[in-house]
């Protein structure tokens, strides 16, 4: 039940950070006017990995486009391609992750598949998670520097527009949710494959024979089986003394050296 | 036909109150931005104060804290309350919709205040 | 506060000919977020309120002859009618947007010749 309850776990709070993700790298408010110097500016501007943007103090808010791919910076275009690579190393994880699901039947897939699936995913998901996490952080420090250095026409990490002097970034929301949502990825990954090692049989599995002596209650365990080849090929084997009530994971897991007293 | 209409000017001596009206046609007031812009007799143009959505005003410095923009949903009007009133506040009060850039397309004709002993 | 300063104070030009009034801000008034300029013109005729005539330094409104046009960007702008009207004679505002308390320059009387 535990193994389960962390893998079931594991992929709920990895879709929930795999949807923040997405959800960053899709907001405008990456970075967005800094208001300390002037705060009441009739004009708010924010800008976004794919588009800059103003809200009117009339109501109206208007975007544009970086329509130039060349024209970036390198910086920009790496927090995008982290963003992105993290999206697609998600969307892959969940996929396979669905898979992996111990409460979820298909076909007649061993549990040794579905703990090697169990821990592709979480390995996806830690790589996702850290590519969110690196590409805010990397967007993080270009707004810092950027902040510091911001002086009248300087060209600016966003497209190589011309920053007018009045205009200093600082963080946006984008910023904490895809710091947030990398984390939660990362969680989730963990998860992921702790649950992958309470779902993967031992690599030698023993046949234990129980009797007492000398008023003790002692597990005997003679020689193992013969490795296997694979984690799923000894499905035959019961045990002999079942030392008590167990969970529904247990029950349905192979035996190892921890199910005896 | 959008139109705008101010109401509520007048003669008023020095510290005393007025509460200009922007009555809109055609136009419903509360889903825009909108201001007060003054001229003084033969001088140029003064902006005074705003509203824009969520409530929030702007104001001139030397009208801060004794005039107060407002509006009135349900009558699709726009105020100007001013308190405190000095002979400087002589003006027509245009009151006018902000638009695309921020720039005032629709104003009204205007009304004209007097502060005098 | 932002200070709009316009020249010249006063312009007489013959009918037909070229207008040029220009604008100056103490400050740029380019958003960085859209790469437009928060300035405005209007036109004021006598006993009238005032008229847009451009916003976004260079977008002419609807319904205004296209012998008006905007030009410039930052910190300078120039308000150009091509070929003076007589219905033209006015006093021209420009306004900046950006920043608040939103700003008028002192006006330029336009006259014919």
């Known amino acids: 039940m535990a193994v389960t309850a962390c893998q079931g776990l594991g992929f709920v709070v990895s879709l929930i950070g795999i949807a923040g993700i997405i959800a960053a790298t899709c907001m405008d408010q990456w970075s967005t006017q800094d208001l300390y110097n002037n705060p009441v500016t009739a004009v708010f501007n924010y800008q976004g990995l794919w588009r800059s943007c103003v809200r009117e103090s009339s109501g109206f808010t208007e975007c544009r486009g970086y329509f130039t791919l060349l024209g970036l910076p390198a910086m920009l275009q790496a927090v995008r391609a982290l963003m992105i690579v993290g999206i697609v190393l998600g969307a892959i994880g969940l996929l396979v992750s669905i898979f992996a699901l111990k409460c979820i039947r298909i076909g007649s897939m061993e549990d040794s598949a579905k703990a090697n699936m169990t821990l592709t995913s979480g390995i996806m998901f830690i790589v996702s998670g850290l590519c969110a996490i690196a590409g805010v952080s990397v967007f993080a420090n270009m707004l810092v520097t950027n902040f510091w250095m911001s002086t009248a026409n300087m060209y600016t990490g966003m497209g190589g527009m011309v920053q007018t002097v009045q205009t200093r970034y600082t963080f946006g929301a984008a910023l904490f949710v895809g710091w947030v949502a990398g984390g939660l990825t990362l969680i989730g990954g963990v998860m992921m494959c702790i649950a992958c090692r309470g779902l993967a049989p031992e690599e030698t599995n023993y046949k234990a024979v129980s009797y007492h002596a000398s008023g003790h209650s002692v597990a005997y365990k003679p020689g193992g089986f013969k490795a296997s080849t694979g984690f799923g090929s000894n499905t035959k084997n019961k045990k002999i003394y079942d030392g008590g009530a167990r969970t529904e994971d247990e029950v349905q897991s192979y035996p190892s050296k921890h199910d005896y007293v | 036909e959008v139109q705008l209409v101010e109401s509520g000017g007048g003669l008023v001596q020095p510290g005393g109150s007025l509460r200009l009206s922007c009555a809109g046609s055609g136009i419903t007031l509360s889903t825009y931005a909108m201001s007060w812009v003054r001229q003084a007799p033969g001088k140029g143009l003064e902006w005074v104060s705003s509203i824009i959505s969520g409530g929030i005003t702007y104001y001139l410095d030397s009208v801060k804290g004794r005039f107060t923009i407002s509006r009135d949903n349900a009558k699709n009007t726009l105020y100007l309350q001013m308190n405190s009133l000095r002979a400087e506040d002589t003006a027509v009060y245009y009151c006018?919709?902000?638009?695309?850039?921020?720039?005032?397309?629709?104003w009204g004709q205007g009304t004209l205040v007097t502060v005098s002993s | 506060d932002i200070v709009m300063t316009q020249s010249p104070d006063s312009l007489a030009v013959s009918l037909g000919e070229r207008a040029t009034i220009n604008c100056k801000s103490s400050q740029s008034l380019l958003s960085s977020g859209n790469q437009r300029n928060y300035l405005t013109w209007y036109q004021q005729k006598p006993g009238q309120p005032p008229k847009k005539l451009i916003y976004?330094?260079?977008t002419r409104e609807s319904g205004v002859p296209d012998r008006f046009s905007g030009s410039g960007s930052g910190t300078d702008f120039t308000l150009t009618i091509s070929s003076l009207q007589a219905e033209d004679v006015a006093v021209y505002y420009c306004?900046?947007?950006?920043?608040?308390?939103?700003?008028f320059g002192q006006g330029t009387k336009l006259e014919i010749k």
């Open positions: 976004w330094a260079s």
């Open positions: 006018a919709r902000k638009y695309h850039g921020n720039a005032l397309d629709y």
């Open positions: 306004q900046q947007n950006y920043f608040y308390p939103l700003t």
